[in-house]
């Protein structure tokens, strides 16, 4: 039963992935742990709150050219880390200087792996928060939205839209745009140097 769902989700992902390298990465192998859906969705380290302590936070070490898009890629942590031991921003990949940080392509693939995991969660009651999130994941992956304006004509007010998955896709798009802009900038610099 799960296999057709996994295959169709995979096809959806490949269709939606924005760049060829991302597709290549996703198609290299199965999603770790895809057969046994995790008990809880695995949060991304990037979005984990820092431990609540009264000690002042250390400023995060950041490359000079770090911008919003790159920040998204650089701060994506290991998806297999236990949610019980989240990374704080200060101890994240950025703080490590030359530590092994995922490439943009890996980060993109990781991002979609999380959404894929959401798709693979066991079925839940129709209106539980988890079910809403699951529907949100499908919507974020191009599925049918539950409450668009055209369906709002009915007397019943629709369930409010879960924006989170849409938001995450946008952050990913911003990261991609930022990366392309940086590549263009680097290319221009290179051409200037060659031109001289």
């Amino acid at each position: 039963m799960r296999l057709p769902l996994l295959v169709s989700a995979g096809v959806l992902l490949v269709a939606l992935l924005p760049c060829p390298p991302c597709r290549a990465l996703l198609s290299r192998g199965p999603v770790p742990g895809a057969r046994q859906a995790p008990q809880h969705p695995q949060p991304l380290d990037f979005f984990q709150p820092p431990p609540q302590s009264e000690q002042p936070q250390q400023p995060q070490a950041r490359p000079v050219l770090l911008r919003m898009g790159e920040e998204y890629f650089l701060r994506l942590g290991n998806l297999n880390k236990s949610p019980a031991a989240p990374l704080s921003p200060a101890s994240s990949l950025l703080a490590g200087g030359s530590g092994s940080r995922p490439s943009p392509e890996q980060a993109t693939a990781n991002f979609f792996r999380v959404l894929l995991q959401q798709l693979l969660l066991p079925r839940r009651s129709l209106d539980s928060p988890a079910a809403l999130a699951e529907r949100g994941a499908r919507n974020a992956l191009g599925g049918h939205q539950e409450a668009p304006e055209r369906e709002r004509r009915s007397e019943e007010p629709p369930i409010s839209l879960d924006l989170t998955f849409h938001l995450l896709r946008e952050v990913l798009e911003m990261a991609r745009a930022e990366q392309l802009a940086q590549q263009a900038h680097s290319n221009r610099k290179l051409m200037e140097i060659i031109g001289k």
Partner: antibody
């Protein structure tokens, strides 16, 4: 450089209509949700409406449902807010903002509803 | 609707001193994925708002590292490690977990 420029704000009588525009440049307009946020004089920020990338889905704050319509023209990199049946309480500076985290804002356009 | 409540509403600070603003939501913003869709904005006098922090703890492009965001669930904090004169304005938190998107009422930071 990302730029958002609102226009169309004027003095209008209660019950009147108005169409606000937001001209976007410096980014791929069709890739992002777009939003209208307003701020009444001396008050805080209030989300008004947002629209998905391709314009297929639109969401509104309750106070403007049925009166305001958000739309976009991706070919012209433009966002619109059609405002009908205007009320005094709609008086505000209207901002357009990019994405669902509102990472860029326009300078705002003032709409005054008064008789 | 999710109600966002900020405190304090007014915050006089001496330059060089730290400042902290609290934002509470009427329901948890912790999404099933582990994300907290909570943003912080600063509106300087006579200007449009500008994004400071997105998704709870991530600094936006060009934002000085003296600004940091933390928190999860219903309690969030914006900290400024050393306030500067240019930090004056009204700070807003906002939730983007679900529609309708809602803002806090704002915290006015002023220099003592």
């Amino acid at each position: 450089e990302v730029q958002l420029v609102e226009s169309g704000g004027v003095l209008v009588q209660p019950g009147g209509s108005l169409r606000l525009s937001c001209a976007a440049s410096g980014f791929t307009f069709s890739s992002y949700w777009m939003t209208w946020v307003r701020q009444a004089p001396g008050k805080g920020l209030e989300w008004v409406a947002n629209i998905k990338q391709e314009g297929s889905e639109k969401y509104y704050v309750d106070s403007v449902k049925g009166r305001f319509t958000i739309s976009r023209d991706n070919a012209k990199n433009s966002l619109f807010l059609q405002m009908n049946s205007l009320r005094a309480e709609d008086t505000a500076v209207y901002y357009c903002a990019r994405t669902l985290i509102f990472d860029y804002w326009g300078q705002g356009t003032l709409v005054t509803v008064s008789s | 609707d999710i109600v966002m409540t900020q405190s304090p509403l007014s915050l006089p600070v001496t330059p060089g001193e730290p400042a902290s603003i609290s934002c509470r939501s009427s329901q948890s913003l912790l999404h099933s994925t582990g994300y907290n869709p909570l943003e912080w904005y600063l509106q300087k006098p006579g200007q449009s708002p500008q994004l400071l922090i997105y998704l709870g703890s991530n600094r936006a492009s060009g934002v000085p590292d003296r600004f940091s965001g933390s928190g999860s669930g219903t309690d969030f904090t914006l900290k400024i490690s050393r306030v500067e004169a240019e930090d004056v304005g009204i700070y807003y938190c906002m939730q983007t977990l679900q529609t309708p998107i809602t803002f806090g009422q704002g915290t006015r930071l002023e220099i003592k």
